[in-house]
Structures are given as C-alpha cells and as structure tokens.
Amino acid sequence: SITGISPITESLASLSTYNDQSITFALEDESYEIYVEDLKKDKKKDKVLLSYYESQHPSSESGDGVDGKMLMVTLSPTKDFWLQANNKEHSVELHKCEKPLPDQAFFVLHNRSFNCVSFECKTDPGVFIGVKDNHLALIKVDYSENLGSENILFKLSEIHHHHHH
C-alpha cells in the first residue's frame, strides 16, 4: 500500500535510455504517443514530472506481511496525463486521468549501477518498463539473470526549474 496520498517529493527530469536515446512525447490525433529516439542537437529534451511515494513492500513469505519500505513513482510528461502500464498489451501508454491515480500509474523505482534507474510495474511484479523497437514496452525480467539488462535501464537528468506543463 502507498503510505501517503501525497508524494514525499517531486522532481522535473528528462528521461533517456541507457544508450542515451531520448524518451519523447507527441500529441497525435488527440492522444499522446511515446517515442524512443536520437534527438537532434538543438532540440530540447521533453520533461517529465516524477512524483515520489513511500510504500510498504509486501512480504514474499506471507502475503499479508510487510517487508520494509520501497519508493514508487508516477511519471507525468504533461498536465493531467500519466504513464500507465497496460499489462494485457504489454505496453506503456499515456492516459489522461484524475487523482487518485490508478495502480497502473505507479512504478517501483529501482536504483541501478551506471547512474541508472528501472521502473517496475506496481500491478505486475517482475515486469519493467523497457525499450523494444524504438518504443516503450513492458518487459518481464528474471531477477536471477537479467536484472542488468540494458533495455530496462534509464537515465534521469534533473531539470532544476519546477515549472511543469
């Protein structure tokens, strides 16, 4: 369960892949598309508002127990739109929604080597946001083998003005 309804902190950042491709958001036919692309030098990186939440980590041994704390995030590239996991389609989509946000909008934030992070679906443990065919997709990861897979590693570059949207 998410401990507080309000975030513990917020941060404005640009999001890129391990291989330094930018995650960009484009309005097309009244809906937003998400792209993974090489940015031209003069083009500004798209900003994402990250809202951080403190959450209880459920115990693996007893389903009703608690095993410590974890950090969750929601990601909003533009007002009233949030990244959401579509577990049926194995896709990552931008949806307009009101608060309280659905569980599909929450991702466990993992601290990785090489100054990278990973985003794990709250609704589907072991499934991470990843890059597939120049798009974001949901990728199942076997912990004991592929936790370092480059396609689930992302870089966050903080932008210091907090003017979002």
Partner: antibody, heavy 119, light 111 residues
Framework: EVQLVESGGGLVQPGGSLRLSCAAS????????MSWVRQAPGKGLEWVAT????????DYVDSVKGRFTISRDDSKNTLYLQMNSLRAEDTAVYYC????????????WGQGTLVTVSS | EIVLTQSPATLSLSPGERATLSCRAS??????????LNWFQQKPGQPPRLLIF???NRGSGIPARFSGSGSGTDFTLTISSLEPEDFAVYYC?????????FGQGTKVEIK
C-alpha cells in the same frame, strides 16, 4: 521473519585469509542487493562491498579492492565475503546488510561476526 | 568521496527532552530529486537499525517521535521527546554514490 545470520569470523594472522558467510531467510534473496559493512572496535561504521540482485554488479571500498571478493549463491540464499591478504586494520565486526526493495538504503542488518587480524 | 560530519559528538540530555542531531555533507547528496541521506541508531552490542531514509521518511516500525529533515548538504534528526531506550549512537549515511559513507556518529547519553 526477515533474518540475516553471519558466520566465519575468528582470529587470523596478518596476510591470512577468511571467508565470511551470511545466511538469509524470510525474503526472496535473489531480488535484493546485499552488502557488507564493518565496524572496528569502538569506532564508526564503514561500508565494505555491495553485490546487486542478479549478481550483475559489485562495488568495493578502495581499501579492500583486490583483496576482498563479495559473492552470492542465490540457490543457497547465502552471501559471502572472501577476505585475502588480511591486515590489522581489517579487524572489525562485519555486518551483512540487505538493501530495501529497489536498492536505495541499508534496511536489514545481521548481528555481525568478529574478525580479528593479529599475530 | 562524500564526507559526512556529525555534530555534536556527544549530546547529554534527560528523558523527555528534545534531541537535535546534525549531519553535514561535503557535497550535495541529492540525486533524481531525492535526498539520499539515511539515519541509523546503534545500541551497545547490537547492529545498527534504520530510522530514517531519504532524509525524512521513517523506516518500518519506527516511532513518530523520530523525524528527519534537510536537503542538499544539511540534515537534521530530531527526537521530539527522548525515551529511555533512545540513548544510543546515531549515524547518518549517504547512498548517493559509491563509496557509501557514514558520519562518525553522535552519542546521545543520559544527563
């Protein structure tokens, strides 16, 4: 209940070797980053080494690089610290620690095992 | 490496009093908009126990009398009203970057 139990400490001569073990229970061991933190008698805490979940990455404090090796056996739920070329300044209580889920901070600590390096 | 300096080295207080402990970092411990500064309590013969993570968030089972604040390089641990079991050594620690470093500790002792 989440538990970490260290073993393998003892008295060893300078230049000698020792292998510490940490038996983990009560959680899905392979999903968590694990570390060793030490504390010299009457002194403060010093991080020694970390190994990520999935055995992908390891990191060490400079003073033990090339001498200590952190490893894990996820099938046995066990963390190890192989210590070679031991020095008097390695004398300390060695704690096994588990990161929180997501690897942001040391969340769970074992009771520690004492390593004494002396001739 | 990031050096953490705690003050005071020793704090002599009575049960019921308020304790304010300081931790200063040699450079910012902020990353991704998070202040990656944690606080631990250690009693004699025991391992450390996580009190506060990410500057201001209580660990599991930590009483509300413990609170953390601060950002950038300056952080504070406050114990609003000291209980007998709170007399111990307190360490701050940064998890922004390797090598992960600890402060030298503040001992809270009974006056």
């Amino acid at each position: 209940e989440v538990q970490l139990v260290e073993s393998g400490g003892g008295l060893v001569q300078p230049g000698g070797s020792l292998r510490l073990s940490c038996a983990a229970s009560g959680f899905t061991f392979s999903s968590f980053s694990m570390s060793w933190v030490r504390q010299a008698p009457g002194k403060g805490l010093e991080w020694v080494a970390t190994i990520s979940g999935g055995k992908t990455f390891t990191d060490y404090v400079d003073s033990v690089k090339g001498r200590f090796t952190i490893s894990r056996d996820d099938s046995k739920n066990t963390l190890y610290l192989q210590m070679n070329s031991l020095r008097a300044e390695d004398t300390a209580v060695y704690y096994c620690t588990r990161a929180n889920y997501g690897n942001w901070f040391f969340e769970v600590w074992g009771q520690g095992t004492l390593v004494t390096v002396s001739s | 490496e990031i050096v953490l300096t705690q003050s005071p080295a020793t704090l002599s207080l009575s049960p019921g009093e308020r304790a304010t402990l300081s931790c200063r970092a040699s450079e910012s411990v902020a990353k991704y908009g998070l202040s990656l500064l944690n606080w631990f309590q250690q009693k004699p013969g025991q391992p450390p126990r996580l009190l506060i993570f990410a500057a201001s968030n209580r660990g599991s089972g930590i009483p509300a009398r413990f609170s953390g604040s601060g950002s950038g390089t300056d952080f504070t641990l406050t114990i609003s009203s000291l209980e007998p079991e709170d007399f111990a050594v307190y360490y701050c620690q940064q998890s922004k970057e390797v090598p992960f470093t600890f402060g030298q500790g503040t001992k809270v002792e009974i006056k």
